[in-house]
Amino acid sequence: QGKEVVLLDFAAAGGELGWLTHPYGKGWDLMQNIMNDMPIYMYSVCNVMSGDQDNWLRTNWVYRGEAERIFIELKFTVRDCNSFPGGASSCKETFNLYYAESDLDYGTNFQKRLFTKIDTIAPDEITVSSDFEARHVKLNVEERSVGPLTRKGFYLAFQDIGACVALLSVRVYYKKCPELLQGLAHFPETIAGSDAPSLATVAGTCVDHAVVPPGGEEPRMHCAVDGEWLVPIGQCLCQAGYEKVEDACQACSPGFFKFEASESPCLECPEHTLPSPEGATSCECEEGFFRAPQDPASMPCTRPPSAPHYLTAVGMGAKVELRWTPPQDSGGREDIVYSVTCEQCWPESGECGPCEASVRYSEPPHGLTRTSVTVSDLEPHMNYTFTVEARNGVSGLVTSRSFRTASVSINQTEPPKVRLEGRSTTSLSVSWSIPPPQQSRVWKYEVTYRKKGDSNSYNVRRTEGFSVTLDDLAPDTTYLVQVQALTQEGQGAGSKVHEFQTLSPEGSGN
């Protein structure tokens, strides 16, 4: 609601203003009436029976101050010209409102020519004889405005040209947009502008402990001519550690926090935090609990997980399958990952070292989310120790580690991988491979073969190489072939038994 700043109030002045009348005593004059034991003053004129009336009433000089546009509210009565028999020719039912600006008070020096007409003031309702005699006068209210004003002060004047008028109230005021708190911004009392289409842009200031959010617009409002605030732009938000309570920002209570400038209220400190002081932007973690850099302040403090609960290592030739179960204590987090490390030890010397370079994992061994992994390319007759470490988002904040280990001894080489390189009606050319780390342990390879379906006899060939040609074979016959590595410590794991067929005589040309 616009604020009105009153510059002149005749009704409130109790007849003390002493306005100038011209001609003196013959036209407008001050009158007093008593209503409810209170004096009511009015300026009245009623020379309706005489023609050529030109009676002026001029206010005292009114200091303009900061006003740009003034509003003039008049309360008055006008009597019906028909109340005056024979006066209809000269009687009027309107009067004229004028103003004049000046930088000084002219006192009793009244000059009509200095005045500019604002408007002819006509009543909405006239007071007829019967109403007048019954004391039921019809009060009219009219408002006009003038602006922009530029001089130090001004006068208003009322010209009577033969009406029967009583002027009960003259109130002159200007409008201000009142001091305002909106969107946690304070807008100062602002003088309304003088031009109807224009809106004065007013910058607001954030209330104590409020800020313009990053990337947000500075608070602004527009003060309209009628003293109303319009078109709010931007806003302020309570800063970290403060929340909105009505039109102010209040510090978070102890045990509560707010970590950023936002519209949200203060939140209760989460689990595993220490009680916060007043105005906290975060809640510190209890001893042994931590917050990862990316953790929101609203999240409970957490700790590293315990070790994987149960770890098994199952050897399969030169492979080991590691399986484990999640930690019993996740530390309050869901971002658990596992890392697998490998150590190998030579039984003869007891010497140990890392074996990451020589083994192969079924998937990268760091940042594992599954609870199993297969390790292959293990060397025979070697002792392996596998460590599975559980980590979460706060593990990096502590020096201790949460891990479980499992050891396994590899007694055999990995089975060779066998391929048929070529064949004829009487021969089969076979090759094989084993992982390079294991090759140094191999003394010879033993190739066993026999006809399919003949379980009574078999042939053995030994070689140091990685291939052999088996000849003197029967045509168009299926042979079962198996390759096994021989090491100083004994036999390694045999390959799968492969079925290879020699060519038939009629297909030998192929």
């Epitope: 004059d29 309706v48 005056f84 009793t108």
Partner: antibody, heavy 120, light 110 residues
Amino acid sequence: QVQLVQSGGGLVQPGGSLRLSCAASGFTFSSYAMHWVRQAPGKCLEWVTVISPDGHNTYYADSVKGRFTISRDNSKNTLYLQMNSLRAEDTAVYYCARASVGATGPFDIWGQGTLVTVSS
Amino acid sequence: SSELTQPPSVSVAPGQTVTITCQGDSLRSYYASWYQQKPGTAPKLLIYGENNRPSGVPDRFSGSSSGTSASLTITGAQAEDEADYYCNSRDSSGTHLTVFGCGTKLTVLG
């Protein structure tokens, strides 16, 4: 106590002059319009003249216009009526009176009256 | 015209009600004021405006107006009310500033 005390009346020959005074007390004299009203022996009250609170404006009844002059000295709280070219028909008791509001009254405070007799 | 006309005299028995009238064109435009004058003294304001009494004036005195007529009514007249009564009004004709009636002599019988 609000009062108006008059002085200066008496017997004067036709064509002569006389000055009446009216001393005010008990109120802010400079805030009120002041009037002179007369009453011929056994006759009606007759309004004579008015002066505005600041003394800048005066108005006279046609019967005395050009012969009588109303004035005031607000510093002395005193109202005056200078009567020149007096006539027999000016014989009357002269009252000063205060207009309670505005220029035309009503007249709420009256002086005690002073008799002016114009006779040869 | 700018004249106010009053009856020269009226009489009333003590305790009775009496009305003094005042006629004039100005009374259409302006309210009358009423004054009481006792012999050898200055007039005293009784009624002004619609029907306003200055402090100290008994409430048995009242005023009213209608058209070109104004009235002063004394309800329950008393012996001390015997006096001359004058009506007065602003002049709407522009001839005079203010006009008085010629007064009404009130006699309280008994």
